[in-house]
Each structure stands twice: as structure tokens, then as C-alpha cells.
């Protein structure tokens, strides 16, 4: 979290943003909240990029203000206009990419004074992954597939019943690159697996972990998934 | 406990169709794999078709493959054996069977239903 | 297609021998394989898989052994409800899922 303040005392006000991750080629969110002024017609505000020279986006006067947002922004922002006027100035940008990545400052200007915070802004790939039982192999195998991961991450197995096992001798992992030439396909094999167990595959890079287990019953196959966006520091 | 029912057998003539169906209860039918298999008067087992958990992926022996279709509705817990151009060769008693949880064989049985194919 | 090959076709057991069932697959199939038991009129009932794990409720009388191609079925002591006939199946490659042909266990 990080908390920012305006420069002189009185005109001063509090400016939060929370750094988050972007999942590229789909949107993202970059949060910033402050305290909020009873006029719209008086609220400003502006997002920065560290290192680029326009502006992210601009909202003043009630109304989006995009003459000096810079190129690589155009036609990809956008801020929650009805909830400015409760301190709401989070920015919504489409088709989040790699280069998206950086600082960003949340600067507001309101009848009560001025404030800025710093954001911190990750991106890359992240998806859910999904465990199931190979019945193509030939030795009792589960296999976990996460469609999108970037940077490359690591995949760890653990089991329910061998709790603090290394699996890796057991288990093979594959990074296949996808389409668009960045982001990769998980695919991770364990092999040997046994019966009345409870399995978890966990994928992690610098931005996200994800885990999906698979419990093995010969009365049920119970599939779960959930995904974790890592360093969501506020400020 | 697993309980499988099937049901839709009977005397048909050859070339017709007929369609199966199995009634599971007592586990998450969701999650298995689901097996046909047939048992011909006096002879031996004979595994027919499997379909996937999620029913996306369907296989069949090369006797019943183009004639034979294998479906689930999983919000009903039922398998299905739908049987196109039926020949005396597939006259038969049909178990539904569930695959076992990590590999195929098969841990629970139907009781079986007589599927006779004679003019 | 993997051809599971059982013998004998027929074996006669008094009440209380010991039964020892073969089964043979065309090529490896490591340790996937079943064994099954039917009764007259009824349907199979699983006994064994992964070559020796007995299935929920066997009892300890049935044990089965072998890995690769060679595979047997033991009755150890054979009681009056054990006279069936007696089914392998291999689940290392498919399609199709094999069976032997099956070993008729009478009383002699």
C-alpha cells in the first residue's frame, strides 16, 4: 500500500494506490483511490508513466481529457467516471501489454488540495491450472495444464498423503511457447500416483501462483483451482 | 454405494437401432470415466467404448466404430449406447461400466441388459 | 491391439486346493492389468488391478502376481461361491481394452 500526500500541509491530501499485476492481452486495473470532493467539475485527475513523456490518461472537468496522452496509451484507458466522485480515480487499461510494465503515479488535484502515489506495475501471464488423470499413460499419471504463463515459472507437485516429498524425480514438465510468441503452456506430468490421495500441482512466477488439486477417490474425482497475484502491495 | 442400471434392450432387427442407457447413483458420475461392454451368449467379454469424464473424448473397438455412438448427460448421471445398423454379431448382454478412478479397469459393473438382433 | 491369451480354458478343483489361473498379453503391459470374476447370470465383479492389489471387499484367499507379459491368479483355498469363470483385462494400451477369453474354474 502506499499512502501519498501533497506537498504543503493544508493543501495536502491522501492519495492510495495498491501495486498489482496485468495479465497481458487481457485488462488490467491500476488502483489508486483518494479522498473524495463534493464537486466532480473540481477533480483532476492524472496518471504518469516513469520514462514516458505523455500522459496515461486525464480526467478533468467531469470528462476524459486525452489531447496529451501519449501514443502507446491511445484508445486503452479509461477511468471509472461514476466513481470519481467517491475517490475512486482507478485506471482500466485494455490489452494489457509486456511493455505496460513500469511505475505509474496516481496525481489528483480536488478543491481540498493536492496528492500522488506511486504504483508499482507488473505484467506478464498467469491462468489457472487444471489437474486430471492421464488414463492415456501407461503408469497411474495425473497431468496439469495452465494454457498462458510469462515469465517461465516453476511447477512444484505435493501430495496430501507424502506431505514434504520431492516429486521431482517422479514428474516432467514442458513450456510450450503459444502462438502470439510470449506467453507458454504449462504442461506438468506426475507419474506413480496412487489411489485415496489428494494431489496439487503449483505453478509460480514472479507475479502470480497457482495451484490446482485433484483428489482420487474410486467414488469421486474432486477438481479445485485458485490463483494468487503476488506483491499486491498498497501504498 | 456405486450402483449401476441399465436399461432400452430388447429384440430388434438387423440394420435398426436401438439406444442403451445406464442409471448411475452412489458416486460423482462427473468425474469417471464411463465403459460399455458386451458379453455375447456363452462367449467372452468384449470392452465396446469409453467415453471421458467430460464427455469430449469418446473410443471405440474397430467392431461397433461409424455404428455404435457412446454420450453422457452429466446432469442426469446417465450413460448412453446409441446403436446404429445393428447386426446379429452384436446380439449381447451390455454392461455399463465406471472406470476405475486412476486407470481403466473396470470397478463397478451394471447388472447388464439383453440386446437380441434376429428377423 | 494387445491379445491377452488365458489358460487353461477349463480347470477342475476340489473344494478347498489351491487354484492357480494363467494369463498371458501379446506384449508388455507392466503391471496393468485386471482380473475378474463372474458367476452364472450375473455380471463381472472386479478381484484384482494393478496386477496384485485386491479390489474393496476380496477377500485374502485371491492374490494375484507377474509384471510384463506373464500373470497368475491364485485361490488359495477354493470355497463353494469361488466356482466362476475367471477374466484378465490389460489397461496399458488402448484402444481397444483387451480380456482373455477366460478360465472356467469347476469342481471336480
Known amino acids: 500500500l502506499i499512502i501519498g500526500f501533497g506537498i504543503s500541509g493544508r493543501h495536502s491530501i491522501t492519495v492510495t494506490t495498491v501495486a498489482s499485476a496485468g495479465n497481458i492481452g487481457e485488462d488490467g486495473i491500476l488502483s489508486c483511490t483518494f479522498e473524495p470532493d463534493i464537486k466532480l467539475s473540481d477533480i483532476v485527475i492524472q496518471w504518469l508513466k516513469e520514462g514516458v513523456l505523455g500522459l496515461v490518461h486525464e480526467f478533468k472537468e467531469g470528462k476524459d481529457e486525452l489531447s496529451e496522452q501519449d501514443e502507446m496509451f491511445r484508445g486503452r484507458t479509461a477511468v471509472f467516471a461514476d466513481q470519481v466522485i467517491v475517490g475512486n480515480a482507478s485506471l482500466r487499461l485494455k490489452n494489457v501489454q509486456l511493455t505496460d510494465a513500469g511505475t505509474y503515479k496516481c496525481y489528483i488535484i480536488t478543491s481540498k488540495g493536492k496528492g500522488n502515489a506511486n504504483l508499482e506495475y507488473k505484467t506478464g501471464a498467469f491462468s489457472m491450472p487444471e489437474v486430471n488423470v492421464d488414463y492415456n499413460a501407461s503408469s497411474e499419471t495425473l497431468r496439469c495444464e495452465a494454457p498462458r504463463w510469462f515469465p517461465q515459472p516453476t511447477v512444484v507437485w505435493a501430495s496430501q498423503v507424502d506431505q514434504g516429498a520431492n516429486f521431482s524425480e517422479v514428474s516432467n514438465t514442458s513450456f510450450e511457447l503459444n502462438s502470439e510468441n510470449v506467453t507458454m503452456k504449462v504442461v506438468s506430468v506426475l507419474y506413480n500416483v496412487t489411489i485415496n490421495n489428494t494431489y496439487s500441482c503449483m505453478i509460480e512466477n514472479d507475479i502470480a501462483k497457482a495451484t490446482g488439486d485433484i483428489k482420487v477417490t474410486e467414488s469421486e474425482i474432486k477438481r479445485r483451482s485458485h490463483l494468487q497475484l503476488l506483491n499486491s502491495k498498497a501504498s | 454405494q456405486v450402483q449401476l442400471v441399465e436399461s432400452g434392450g430388447g429384440v430388434v432387427q438387423p440394420g435398426r437401432s436401438l439406444r442403451l442407457s445406464c442409471a448411475a447413483s452412489?458416486?460423482?458420475?462427473?468425474?469417471?470415466?464411463m465403459h460399455w461392454v458386451r458379453q455375447a451368449p456363452g462367449k467372452g467379454l468384449e470392452w465396446v467404448a469409453v467415453?471421458?469424464?467430460?464427455?469430449?473424448?469418446?473410443y471405440y473397438a474397430d467392431s461397433v466404430k461409424g455404428r455404435f455412438i457412446i454420450s453422457r448427460d452429466n446432469s442426469k448421471d446417465t450413460l448412453y449406447l446409441q446403436m446404429n445398423s445393428l447386426r446379429a454379431g452384436d446380439t449381447a448382454v451390455y454392461y455399463c461400466?465406471?472406470?476405475?478412478?486412476?486407470?481403466?479397469?473396470?470397478?463397478?459393473w451394471g447388472q447388464g441388459t439383453l440386446v437380441t438382433v434376429s428377423s | 491391439e494387445i491379445v491377452m491369451t488365458q489358460s487353461p480354458a477349463t480347470l477342475s478343483v476340489s473344494p478347498g486346493e489351491r487354484a492357480t489361473l494363467s494369463c498371458r498379453a501379446s506384449?508388455?503391459?507392466?503391471?496393468?492389468l485386471g482380473w475378474y470374476q463372474q458367476k452364472p447370470g450375473q455380471a463381472p465383479r472386479l478381484l484384482i488391478y494393478?496386477?496384485?492389489t485386491r479390489a474393496t471387499g476380496i477377500p485374502a484367499r485371491f492374490s494375484g502376481s507377474g509384471s510384463g507379459t506373464e500373470f497368475t491368479l491364485t485361490i488359495s483355498s477354493l470355497q463353494s461361491e469361488d466356482f466362476a469363470v475367471y477374466y484378465c483385462?490389460?489397461?496399458?494400451?488402448?484402444?481397444?481394452?483387451?480380456f482373455g477369453g477366460g478360465t472356467k474354474v469347476e469342481i471336480k
Open positions: 467415453i471421458s469424464y467430460e464427455g469430449s473424448n469418446e
Open positions: 494393478g496386477a496384485s
Open positions: 461400466a465406471k472406470g476405475g478412478g486412476l486407470r481403466w479397469y473396470f470397478a463397478y
Open positions: 452412489g458416486f460423482t458420475f462427473r468425474s469417471f470415466g
Open positions: 483385462q490389460q489397461y496399458q494400451s488402448w484402444p481397444p481394452l483387451t
Open positions: 506384449q508388455s503391459i507392466s503391471s496393468n
